[in-house]
Interface confidence: medium
């Protein structure tokens, strides 16, 4: 959480960002929010990012204004037009690229004053592990795979009846470069599992952890995943 | 080998009550959960029910909730399934079922006991 | 509840010829779906277990695949014993275990 103050004159408002991630290939959201105004047509809101001449995006008078505009951003970005008033100046990104990482600054003017703010944008791949039983292993073993992740993962699997043990020795796991040649598919086998237990299997890089969990008994099979962002917030 | 014998069907009215047996042999029944299954005439098969190897844990398909209880005794390797409150519905030929391991699909099976719900 | 359907509900093949199964989940089971055969006052019998593995003791020219929503059991060479009726069955979340309505395989 990033919180920036400006000064024109005697005014000064506050602008907010959040940390924030972009999974690339899909489309992402740079958050930033400031003390609203009602007159539109007296916000400007303009997106930069360093190292790059030219805007990533303005908005300015009710609409966007793309003559600034960077070439890698052209066609890209979009604002939040109908929340503007209310203090959103968060932009979209589609299609998230590899070298959309860097830091941004959202800059703000309103007829109460002016400010800014910077977030961190990192980007990557994460995505959710799905658990199956293995049935091409010759024991009773666990699958987790999960289908786009970069930079390269680490994966962990945990037991809720073994807390704390090791399972590097009994688990392989490997990383298939998918077609796009950037991100990863991330499979994991763990072997000699047993009934009457719940396992996690853990991927985690700089940017998301994932957690996939089966619960495995004679009586029934509940799975669950879940994904987090890291940094962000 | 392993072996799943039913027993206990039989023709029974609307309302009434039955208990179907299950004597399992040939592996150790203590450590697997069983399952029954049923078949209505021409029709295809549905899940009843499934008790955990201790007995600590059941599940009933919507279709019986409350109506039927699955408990086993270990001691004599036996099965059973109470069904209680009958209906016309419940006429089937019920199968028990061995499940186990990681592997929730049905290698075992008994050769079923017919169930007739009629006035 | 996971839905299970099965196509076609009758299929009426020569002896000899090939048959083709199909089965699909009303959401993704991975691979976790098993193959059942029964005959007329019969118990099922296991075929294939985790979508493409045939059971112990079953012949060759059975054999599965398909994953995610979409599977077929296929009989390459249709025996005259092979005349029966096939269940599809997911296990990959349960409580309910759930079969599909079944294909009756008759003699064209």
């Known amino acids: 959480l990033i919180i920036g103050f400006g000064i024109s004159g005697k005014h000064f408002i506050t602008v907010t960002t959040f940390t924030s991630a972009g999974n690339i290939g899909e489309d992402g959201t740079l958050s930033c929010t400031f003390e609203p105004d009602i007159k539109l047509n007296g916000i400007v809101i303009q997106w930069l990012k360093e190292g790059i001449k030219g805007l990533v995006h303005e908005f300015k008078e009710g609409k966007d204004d793309l003559s600034q505009q960077h070439e890698m951003f052209r066609g890209r970005t979009a604002v939040f037009a109908d929340q503007v008033v209310v203090g959103n100046a968060s932009l979209r990104l589609k299609n998230v690229q590899l070298t959309d990482a860097g830091t941004y600054t959202c800059y703000i003017r309103t007829s109460k004053g002016k400010g800014n703010a910077n977030l961190e944008y990192k980007t990557g791949a994460f995505s959710m592990p799905e658990i199956n039983v293995d049935y091409n292993a010759s024991s009773e073993s666990l699958r987790c795979e999960a289908p786009r992740w970069f930079p390269q993962p680490t994966v962990a699997w945990a037991s809720q009846v073994d807390q704390g043990a090791n399972f590097s020795e009994v688990s392989n796991t490997s990383f298939e470069l998918n077609s796009e040649n950037v991100t990863m598919k991330v499979v994991s086998v763990l072997y000699n599992v047993t009934i009457n237990n719940t396992y996690s299997c853990m991927i985690e890089n700089d940017i998301a952890k994932a957690t996939g969990d089966i619960k495995v008994t004679d009586s029934e099979v509940k799975r669950r995943s879940q994904l987090q962002l890291l940094n962000s917030g | 080998q392993v072996q799943l014998v039913e027993s206990g069907g039989g023709v029974v009215q609307p309302g009434r009550s039955l208990r179907l047996s299950c004597a399992a042999s040939?592996?150790?029944?203590?450590?697997?959960?069983m399952h029954w299954v049923r078949q209505a005439p021409g029709k295809g098969l549905e899940w009843v029910a499934v008790?955990?190897?201790?007995?600590?844990?059941?599940y009933y398909a919507d279709s019986v909730k409350g109506r039927f209880i699955i408990s086993r005794d270990n001691s004599k390797d036996t099965l059973y399934l109470q069904m209680n409150s009958l209906r016309a519905g419940d006429t089937a030929v019920y199968y028990c079922?061995?499940?186990?391991?990681?592997?929730?699909?049905?290698?075992?099976w008994g050769q079923g006991t017919l169930v007739t719900v009629s006035s | 509840e996971i839905v299970m359907t099965q196509s076609p509900a009758t299929l009426s093949v020569s002896p000899g010829e090939r048959a083709t199964l199909s089965c699909r989940a009303s959401?993704?089971?991975?691979?976790?779906l098993g193959w059942y055969q029964q005959k007329p006052g019969q118990a099922p019998r296991l075929l294939i277990y985790?979508?493409?593995t045939r059971a112990t003791g079953i012949p060759a020219r059975f054999s599965g695949s398909g994953s995610g929503t979409e599977f077929t059991l296929t009989i390459s060479s249709l025996q005259s014993e092979d005349f029966a009726v096939y269940y599809c069955?997911?296990?990959?979340?349960?409580?309910?275990?759930?079969f599909g309505g079944g294909t009756k395989v008759e003699i064209k």
């Open positions: 985790g979508a493409s």
């Open positions: 959401q993704s089971i991975s691979s976790n």
């Open positions: 069955q997911q296990y990959n979340s349960w409580p309910p275990l759930t």
């Open positions: 040939g592996f150790t029944f203590r450590s697997f959960g």
């Open positions: 079922a061995k499940g186990g391991g990681l592997r929730w699909y049905f290698a075992y």
């Open positions: 008790i955990s190897y201790d007995g600590s844990n059941e």
